[in-house]
Interface confidence: low
């Protein structure tokens, strides 16, 4: 230990400490001591900066003394004690109460020391994400919208695509007073690739310990994109029964299929069967372009197919078959 | 003195649409939030949506997301509840109600007189 | 869903104290929920009592209060007039929506 006198004593606490929008949260601070040093405490106070008077004071004989009494408290300093633990607790904390205070001792012989500590009054802010449902619109609109509900300081929102776009960010005042409410829009050019996908919203804010990532499944609504599958172009006489396929994508979900030809209603060797198309074996070649309608919410699409039934090849030809 | 004055009764089909007013006074009209809450004959309170008048953002209880558009036309301190493919259940009265300050948050401070929706074939 | 649940109906006295309560099914009440107290008389419009727990609206009688009572938020009448006659609702807010409780009618009787 050093000898008497040679140390200083010296007020801990941390330079910034956070606290939560309507909760309590103690100012830490401390008198460390070294050594054999002898020092008395007569009094602790807290003030803040830019006020006049002190918000709390801790007096050796007369005990405590609050601005606000019913939102101050000395966590650990009591009569009868030595005071070297200045820790004040403060509750229902207030936007108005972010910034600096100064914590001090007044001790003899070594005088008064001080710190500053600066409060910093978070609030933890709500998340959501919701999916804007769309249709073709061929220019560039909202499909995603994230928002984060009364954060302070406001929270950073920003999206991860694959798909190209854009954000388009807000910030409105939030309900309680000081925070602020975050409102973020995905915009893109719809597409029918882009249904289905999804896109992700990142919500950082100083409250959490990760970002908050919320995923969001777009919904694009479009008419029927249609194509016919099943033919080879080796089509042959006298083989087995070949089936065409009509392949639609489109949301909602298609309501009807309608097989005709390009020379009207379907000849007797081809029988519709909802979205597939059943051509039954023919004496004779033909050569025929069949069309496929499909029809969904947003409207009808057709895609059309030219069949050739050729005279037959070696009988071990696979022929007709499809299946 | 802080008034809201709402647009008169209305009355519709099903599947039709209505928009209702709100007509502000005695206050700056874009520095606070106004909501809109409906009460069914007989039924309690059922809030619908705020706007914040100074920016237009807007937040929607989800019963009514895709159905209803909440707007303001600062220049005539006037904020606007349309909802779209009524049905007989939102026969009801509907009121806007501005949010007042104390300092701590936002509160339902002054109610317009309400409007009467009769969704009725 | 939230579910807002309040006394459909309470008495009290003239001069007497009466605490309304609200109820939230998802938990206790905090002041995040930024308690709202409503006022409604027969025949007149709506009016704010109480934002934010416990904060009284400018103009509101000091005979209102607002609290927390354990997990409910409160509204406490002290001293109830014949005019305190009405429907009291309560809204609680849900990070991103307000829901109103059913509503006690107080009779002062």
């Known amino acids: 230990w050093p000898p008497p006198g040679t140390g200083d004593i010296v007020v801990q606490a941390p330079t910034q400490v956070p606290g939560f929008l309507g909760d309590s949260v103690t100012l830490p601070c401390y008198l460390q001591v070294p050594g054999m040093e002898e020092t008395h405490v007569s009094q602790l106070t807290w003030s803040r900066h830019g006020e006049s008077g002190s918000m709390a004071v801790f007096h050796q004989t007369q005990g405590p003394n609050y601005s606000e009494p019913k939102r101050l408290e000395f966590v650990a300093a009591r009569l009868g004690t030595e005071l070297r633990d200045a820790s004040l607790r403060m509750f229902g904390l207030r936007v108005e109460d972010e910034g600096n205070y100064t914590c001090l001792f007044v001790a003899f012989p070594q005088g008064s020391r001080s710190v500053d500590i600066w409060l910093r009054v978070l609030a933890k802010p709500q998340n959501t994400a919701e999916v804007q449902k769309v249709q073709l619109t061929g220019k560039p609109v909202p499909v995603a919208r994230c928002v984060s509900t009364g954060g302070r300081p406001p929270a950073h929102i920003t999206w991860h695509s694959d798909l190209g776009g854009m954000p388009n960010t807000s910030q409105a005042p939030g309900f309680l007073s000081g925070t602020v409410t975050v409102t973020s829009l995905w915009i893109l050019v719809p597409s029918s690739q882009v249904d289905g996908k999804s896109v992700t919203c990142k919500v950082e804010h100083e409250s959490f310990e990760k970002p908050q990532l919320l995923t969001v499944n777009l919904t694009v609504y479009y008419p029927p994109e249609v194509s016919i599958s099943g033919y080879d172009n080796n089509w042959y006489l006298s083989q087995n029964e070949a089936t065409l396929t009509c392949d639609a994508r489109s949301n909602p979900e298609p309501t009807g299929y309608n097989w005709s030809t390009t020379m009207g209603p379907l000849p007797p060797f081809a029988v519709a069967q909802g979205a597939q198309l059943l051509i039954r074996p023919v004496d004779k070649p033909i050569n025929t372009t069949f069309i496929c309608n499909v029809t969904n919410a947003l409207g009808a699409r057709q895609a059309e197919l030219t069949v050739q039934v050729k005279e037959g090849p070696p009988s071990e030809h696979s022929g007709m078959s499809s299946n | 003195q802080v008034q809201l004055v709402q647009s008169g009764a209305e009355v519709k089909k099903p599947g039709a649409s209505v928009k209702v007013s709100c007509k502000a006074s005695g206050y700056t009209f874009t520095s606070s939030y106004i909501s809109w809450v409906r009460q069914a004959p007989g039924q309690g309170l059922e809030w619908i949506a705020w706007?914040?008048?100074?920016?237009?953002?807007?937040n929607y209880n989800q019963k009514f997301t895709g159905r209803v558009t909440m707007t303001t036309d600062t220049s005539t301190s006037t904020a606007y509840m349309e909802l779209r493919s009524l049905r007989s259940d939102d026969t009801a009265v509907y009121y806007c109600?501005?949010?007042?300050?104390?300092?701590?948050?936002?509160?339902?401070?002054?109610w317009g007189q309400g409007t009467t929706v009769t969704v009725s074939s | 869903q939230a579910v807002v649940t309040q006394e459909p109906s309470l008495t009290v006295s003239p001069g007497g104290t009466v605490t309304l309560t609200c109820r939230s099914s998802?938990?206790?009440?905090?002041?995040?929920?930024?308690a709202n107290w409503v006022q409604q008389k027969p025949g007149q419009a709506f009016r704010g009592l109480i934002g934010h727990t416990n904060n009284r609206a400018p103009g509101v009688p000091a005979r209102f209060s607002g609290s927390l009572l354990g997990d409910k938020a409160a509204l406490t009448l002290s001293g109830a007039q014949p005019e305190d006659e009405a429907e009291y609702y309560c809204?609680?807010?849900?990070?991103?929506?307000?829901?109103f409780g059913g509503g006690t009618k107080l009779t002062v009787l």
């Open positions: 809204a609680l807010w849900y990070s991103n929506k307000f829901v």
């Open positions: 998802t938990g206790a009440v905090t002041t995040s929920n930024l």
């Open positions: 109600a501005r949010h007042g300050y104390t300092g701590r948050g936002w509160y339902f401070a002054v």
């Open positions: 706007i914040y008048a100074g920016t237009g953002d807007t």
